[in-house]
């Protein structure tokens, strides 16, 4: 095509996670998928300076067709900011990742005490549960609701019936997954909610209860101030 165009990002979802905490000896891959016309070139900076092969033992790989930088067997000296600079004659764009190389003993995910907290709201109200997770290794986080089937909370095997409400996926950021929003609450939403965090060492989970109260009468609704639930 003759349509000249400055560089642009083609897959911002793959770039959302800026902070990468990676265990020592693991492989790190940073991606900056881009487009433009003419096709842009890509170069990498470490802490704002040109990143050269001799800057690290074993060097690194650049896969131009995948717009990626790959470092194998990372060590503490690899910590820092890595910036991809994508440019053509019509412009330049850049994106920075921060790499932290974790040396301490990896442990089960730690969930902040008291979270998620029990909550109550009226029918039609909104509620949110918050879960704060600390993990050396990248955790996978899920929000789970304990549900009933045929009036029972447990199956014939004695295990509880569960429904995964939300799980970290390709398009979900760490911050988004830490909060579970429930809008326009109904009585069916009442019950036990569990935040589960797992990594390669193990799984940890905390639970909280949602209590749903009947909505007040219409007269109260009209006269009540917006913060009458507090």
């Amino acid at each position: 095509s003759n349509n000249k165009r400055a560089p642009y990002w083609t897959n911002t979802e793959k770039m959302e996670k800026r902070l990468h905490a990676v265990p020592a000896a693991n492989t790190v891959k940073f991606r900056c998928p881009a487009g433009g016309n003419p096709m842009p070139t890509m170069r990498w900076l470490k802490n704002g300076k040109e990143f050269k092969q001799e800057h690290r033992i074993g060097g690194y790989k650049v896969r131009n067709q995948h717009w990626s930088l790959i470092m194998e067997s990372v060590v503490p000296s690899d910590k820092g900011n890595y910036t991809c600079v994508v440019e053509n004659e019509y412009g330049s764009i850049n994106h920075t990742y921060h790499l932290d190389v974790v040396e301490r003993s990896p442990h089960r995910p730690i969930l902040q005490a008291g979270l998620p907290a029990n909550a109550s709201t009226v029918v039609g109200g909104d509620v949110e549960f918050v879960c704060k997770v600390y993990s050396d290794a990248q955790p996978h986080i899920q929000w789970i609701k304990h549900v009933e089937k045929n009036g029972s909370k447990y199956g014939p095997d004695g295990l509880p019936y569960l429904k995964v409400l939300k799980a970290a996926g390709v398009n979900t950021t760490d911050k988004e997954i830490e909060v579970l929003y429930i809008r326009n609450v109904t009585f069916e939403d009442a019950g036990e909610y569990t935040c589960l965090a797992g990594n390669s060492i193990g799984i940890s989970f905390h639970s909280a209860w949602l209590t749903v109260l009947p909505a007040p009468g219409r007269e109260k609704e009209i006269t009540a101030s917006p913060d009458y639930l507090e």
């Epitope: 693991n26 569960l162 990594n199 390669s200």
Partner: antibody
Framework: EVQLLESGGGVVQPGRSLRLSCAAS????????MHWVRQAPGKGLEWVAV????????YYADSVKGRFTISRDNSKNTLSLQMNSLRVEDTAIYYC?????????????????WGQGTMVTVSS | DIVMTQSPDSLAVSLGERATISCTSS???????????VYWYQQKPGQPPKLLIY???NRFSGVPDRFSGSGSRTDFTLTISSLQAEDVAVYYC?????????FGGGTKVEIK
């Protein structure tokens, strides 16, 4: 039936390499972290390495760091341990062990299923 | 690294009598989720270890109720309430809270 079956053990000279494999069946392999644990003849158990369910995180015991590499192929339900620069003290039975899964569990979250083990002898 | 210290190294108990194995960790295994991540295994000659007890005191499926686990934070106990002939084995404790995962040195249980 949930099963882990190790293979690839044998006798090897110090400094040489060996690759162990573990074939998993009876469960969703791609949803579980996996470990290697070893046991020297007449001795206790020693944890060797772990790999996350998707292969993105790996951890090693200090005694094997830089020499052993754990990997997995979820399309083939296979766990591997590449052992380089082998030493006499690496002589042991190597067990493949299922680790934590990705979801909610009412039982133990891993270290419940062990393979039968494969013997590695490092001797000159 | 967390050090797991088991005692005694070996134990001879009469059939039908109680066997008690101790395990001490160099730091607390009580996690923020309220669970204590100590596991107990039984290993017979020529076999892989078998899980008996997980998370301090939970019996794994199929494990006879004569096996029980107890303790708190750093001090743990595996008890066989009435020793049977098939219980002759080596028993290991393990911490499952952080890597490197570590095991006790083992306790060999025999019949007196």
């Amino acid at each position: 039936e949930v099963q882990l079956l190790e293979s690839g053990g044998g006798v090897v000279q110090p400094g040489r390499s060996l690759r162990l494999s573990c074939a998993a069946s009876g469960f969703t392999f791609s949803s579980y972290a996996m470990h290697w644990v070893r046991q020297a003849p007449g001795k206790g158990l020693e944890w060797v390495a772990v790999i996350s369910y998707d292969g993105s995180n790996k951890y090693y015991a200090d005694s094997v760091k830089g020499r052993f590499t754990i990997s997995r192929d979820n399309s083939k339900n296979t766990l591997s341990l590449q052992m380089n620069s082998l030493r006499v003290e690496d002589t042991a039975i190597y067990y493949c062990v299922r680790g934590a899964g990705r979801g909610y569990t009412y039982g133990p979250d891993g270290f419940d299923i062990w393979g039968q083990g494969t013997m590695v002898t490092v001797s000159s | 690294d967390i050090v797991m210290t088991q005692s005694p190294d070996s134990l001879a108990v009469s059939l039908g009598e109680r066997a008690t194995i101790s395990c001490t960790s160099s730091r607390s295994l009580l996690h923020s989720d309220g669970k204590t991540y100590v596991y107990w295994y039984q290993q017979k000659p020529g076999q892989p270890p078998k899980l008996l007890i997980y998370e301090l005191s939970n019996r794994f499926s199929g494990v006879p109720d004569r096996f029980s686990g107890s303790g708190s934070r750093t001090d743990f106990t595996l008890t066989i309430s009435s020793l049977q002939a098939e219980d002759v084995a080596v028993y290991y404790c393990m911490q499952y809270i952080e890597a490197p995962l570590t095991f006790g040195g083992g306790t060999k249980v025999e019949i007196k």
